[in-house]
Structures are given as C-alpha cells and as structure tokens.
C-alpha cells in the first residue's frame, strides 16, 4: 500500500477582503489514523488554523463532512478574510501518538493573498489661510490596501496636477499597506470655489478610482480692496461718504471710520453682496456735519480683514467753503451702513 | 448538557417492524455523526449503524438490509428502522454520539424492544 | 473482535489496569462503563487516551499498535463496573467492543 500523501492542490489563492477563502486539502489514505491539522506558516511559531481533533475555530468551515467515515477530504474555508490573513497555510496529517500526536506528513502549502481596498482618501489643507500667489500644500493619505501597487493623481478643478510627491509605506512585504502625498498649488485671486481632488485607483477598486476633495474656500483669504468717496451733498452742511470693500473674502470683516484718527463708528459686515468667484463685496457710509468743523476732516476706512492686519484707505473732506459754527467740536452724525452696493 | 433520549420500542412479533427515534440537545446535532448501539440481554455491547452529519450511512454486516438509519436535523432526531425482526433482535438500543474519529462519548438510556411471539 | 479479560478485582485504592487487544494501528480505541445491565454506559476514554469534562482523573487510557489499556489510579467502590473497550477501525469503517471486563472492588 503506497503512502499516504497530502495534496494541496493550489499554491496559491487571490481572495478580496471580506470574502471567503477556500483552502483545499486531500489525503490519499486513511492511514496512518491520526487528526489533520491547518496551520499558517511553517515552523516552531506557526499558527494554528484548524483542528479536526478538537477546539472552536468559528472562522472557520470544512468543505466537505469530516464525520463521512470515508471522508479523505479535508478542504477549509476562512470567512471574512481580512489583510491580517495573508500567508501561506499548509494542511499536516499527524500520526496519532501517546502523549501527543507526531506530524506524519504536511501538503506544499497554499500562499493566501488578500485584496483589500484602500479607505476613502483623505485630503487635509493647511492650518491658516493664505493668499492668491502663494503657494500651499495638500496632503492625502489613504490606508489599508492590498497588493502594493497603486496609482495617486492630483486635480485642481479637473486639471491634472504635477508637483506632488508620494510615497507608500512600508516599503517592504506587509499585510496592508499606506500612501501618503504632498501636492503644491498656487493660489489665485479665483480660487474660492475651486476644488482640490486627489484620486487613487487600485486593482480592487475596479476601475472606479476613490476621491477624496479639498474645498480651496477653507484655505484661500482673499485682502479686500477699499475705494473711498465723497457723494455729493444730501443736504446743506452734510457730505455722505461711503467706503466700498470689494473683492474679499472670507466675510469675516470689522470696518472702523476715524476721523483725524479718532475713531468714530465701527462695524461688522453683516448684509454682503456675493460676486459669481464667490468673493464679496460690501459697502459702508458716513454722514459728516462739516458745519461742525472748522479745519479740513481727514475720513479714513479701516478694514481689519479675518483676523489680518488691518488696512485703511483715507479722504480729504475739504470744509473751508462752508460756514464754521463755533464751539463744536463732534464732526459725524452715526448712521446705520447704507445697504446699497456699488459696483 | 448533552441528552439523548431515545424512545419507540416495545413489544413485536417476529417479521415485524418498529421505528426508534433519538431525541438529541443540548449540542449541535447537526454537526455530528450518530450512531445507534444495542445489547442483548446478559450479553454486551454490539453496534449497530452509524450515519454522519450529512447523512451517509454505515452499517454491520450482520443487520445491513433490514435495518436502516437515518435522521432529520431540523427536528434534532435520529431514527433506527427495524424490518423483518426477529428473536435475536431483542435487546436495548441506545444511541450515541460519535466523536470526530468515531468512537463514543455520549449515551442515552437505552429503550427495550423485545420479539417474542 | 476485541479481547479483554473477563474480571478484574481491586482493594479500594489500588491502581487496575485492563487491557484489551485484537486491534491494530488503524483503530482508535474507547472504554465504557456500564454499572448494571440495562443501564446507560458511561464513557470513561476516549480517542485513546481522551477524558470526557466530568470524568474524574483517576481514569486515564493509553494505547500501542494492537492493545489499548484503561488504568484506574486509587481505584473506589463506586468504580465497581463492567466496562467494554471500543474501537473504531479506519480500515473497515466499523465500531466493535470487547466482550467486557466486571471490577469488583474488594
């Protein structure tokens, strides 16, 4: 009688995470009478997969019925496989034996590789805010995937990206592996509805890339420009002049009118007019009494802009044609900003 | 814990037939093989059949033909039927349960069938 | 068939051994206890040399090629039985036991 052999029939198998993995095992005899035994890997460290002796496996199910007395067919499958199952698994006939069973004969092994889909890329910005011509950077990182190999690109509103620097880790063999990207963009003054998408396409995914996206909005800080006016005079011994920030964005925006550098009335930008970039604009006036004043007014417009410094922009409210009425010293009459825009 | 309750002998002439049923619990029925074991009176141990989970079945040589076994896993029951009984049929029956190399480690308390005429 | 003696008998504490023989390398042997005709067995051994949870570690069985062997390490008078050797033969898909062998605890 020829001696009993081990078949494992696949050197390998390709298995997608979250499948079920069929190992095949036959043996050519029932004897020597001993357990058959799964482990993965080879070796003192081995790791045991399935006992047919004895021991709770929930992972794991035989193919055919081991209670056929008969049964030479000791195929397993793995449900839910993850990255973490990858290896080699080999099928071992053991020889009963007192105290322990001896291993009798072991199949070649069958190498189990695990297809694992990278998780949805995540694009981070930078911390503060920058401004048009400058240049930031976006990361994105994506993790858990499996085979190796895989393909990263950049978009800035659907075009193609080229400064950008990747890297997978771990560089050697691994479960599951990481890539991780750096990409540089230039700003310009358009960018508050622009998008930054990084794409990452892998075997597993089916042709169907991830994406993952960056709104420029959270990243780009776009300084107002300021243009002060005189109106014409709404009535005898009143000029209304009016400050228009144009052009900025986000909306955070506190506007403060000095008069001769002393401050007369400061306002947050409340009700603002979108542009189709997606910048703003708002305007504010002032109401000055010049019968109140005996010297020429300097007004001036200061903007503190998201937090930045502020910036200011001036006019010179010439009031020697009109009468001085003595003893007074207050120069503005307050009023509410004006809620129309002008363009 | 495991139980196994058998039930359905009694008294037959001989050339009749009985059906003996198992009632299993306890442990999953349905994962295991079974087998069904008797003793003579003043004699001792003698097996009889054996069927796996998934229903293969196994006999000794001097009762295949009259006597058949089976089981049904969504009522966790086995069953011995008895064609053709004779005299020398009469015994306790017990069934066990196999272990993964089909030996036994758990038994019921038996049920009497007695031929006689 | 499998043989094994017909009696043994013990004092209390004493350690028995029962042998049975007949098999071969491709049986694997079990041992049963039965207390009175008619009764339900008990299996004591299993696979060997198998212990079933809640029998107690006096009991221990070993086997080699053809002849398994059940020991009962300080023997009591409750282990007083009949107890039957099993085996299952790989070679013939088939279930035998030995004629029995009576403990008499003395």
């Known amino acids: 009688e020829e001696e009993l052999q081990v078949i494992q029939p696949d050197k390998s198998v390709l298995v997608a995470a979250g499948e079920t993995a069929t190992l095949r095992c036959t043996a050519t005899s029932l004897i020597p009478v001993g357990p058959i035994q799964w482990f993965r890997g080879a070796g003192p460290g081995r790791e045991l997969i399935y006992n047919q002796k004895e021991g709770h496996f929930p992972r794991v199910t035989t193919v055919s019925d081991l209670t056929k007395r008969n049964n030479m067919d000791f195929s397993i499958r793995i449900g839910n496989i993850t990255p973490a199952d990858a290896g080699t698994y080999y099928c071992v006939k053991f020889r009963k034996g007192s105290p322990d069973d001896v291993e009798f004969k072991s199949g070649a092994g069958t190498e189990l590789s695990v297809r694992a889909k990278p998780s949805a890329p995540v694009v981070s910005g930078p911390a503060a805010r920058a401004t048009p011509q400058h240049t930031v950077s976006f990361t994105c990182e994506s993790h858990g995937f499996s085979p190796r190999d895989i393909t990263l690109k950049w978009f800035k509103n659907g075009n193609e990206l080229s400064d950008f620097q990747t890297n997978v880790d771990p560089v050697g063999e691994s479960v599951s592996y990481s890539i991780h990207s750096t990409a540089k963009v230039v700003l310009t003054r358009e960018d508050v509805h622009s998008q930054v998408i990084c794409e990452v396409a892998h075997v597993t995914l089916q042709g169907d890339p991830l994406r993952g996206t960056a709104n420029l909005s959270e990243t780009i800080r776009v300084p107002p420009t300021l243009e002060v006016t005189q109106q014409p005079v709404r009535a005898e011994n009143q000029v209304n002049v009016t400050c228009q920030v144009r052009k900025f964005y986000p909306q955070r925006l506190q506007l403060t009118w000095l008069e001769n550098g002393n401050v007369s009335r400061t306002e947050t930008a409340s009700t603002v007019t979108e542009n189709k970039d997606g910048t703003y604009n708002w305007m504010s006036w002032l109401l000055v009494n010049v019968s109140a004043h005996r010297d020429d007014v300097k007004l001036t417009c200061q903007v503190e802009h998201d937090g930045q410094p502020a910036v200011s922009k001036s006019h010179d409210l010439k009031v020697s044609a009109h009468p001085k009425e003595q003893g007074s010293n207050t120069a503005a009459e307050n009023t509410g900003s004006n809620e129309r825009n002008i363009y | 814990d495991v139980q196994l309750v058998e039930s359905g002998g009694g008294v037959v002439r001989p050339g009749e037939s009985l059906r003996l049923s198992c009632a299993a619990s306890g442990f999953s029925f349905s994962s295991n093989a079974m087998s069904w074991v008797r003793q003579a009176p003043g004699k001792g141990l003698e097996w009889v059949a054996g069927i796996s989970a998934s229903g293969d079945t196994y006999y000794s040589g001097s009762m295949k033909g009259r006597f058949t076994i089976s089981r049904d896993n969504s009522k966790n029951t086995l069953y011995l039927q008895m064609n053709s009984l004779t005299a020398e049929d009469t015994a306790v029956y017990y069934c066990?349960?196999?272990?993964?190399?089909?030996?036994?480690?758990?038994w019921g308390l038996g049920t009497l069938v007695t031929v006689s005429s | 068939a499998l043989t094994q003696p017909a009696s043994v008998s013990a004092n209390p504490g004493e350690t028995v051994k029962i042998t049975c023989s007949g098999g071969s390398d491709s049986y694997y042997y079990g041992w049963h206890q039965q207390k009175s005709p008619g009764s339900a067995p008990v299996t004591v051994i299993?696979?060997?040399?198998q212990r079933p949870p809640d029998i107690p570690s006096r009991f221990s069985g070993s086997a080699s090629g053809s002849t398994t062997t059940l020991t009962i390490t300080g023997v009591r008078a409750e282990d007083e039985a009949v107890y039957y050797c099993g085996g299952y033969d790989y070679s013939t898909y088939t279930n035998t036991f030995g004629a029995g062998t009576t403990l008499t605890v003395l």
């Open positions: 299993y696979s060997d040399d």
């Open positions: 066990a349960r196999e272990t993964w190399n089909h030996l036994f480690d758990y």
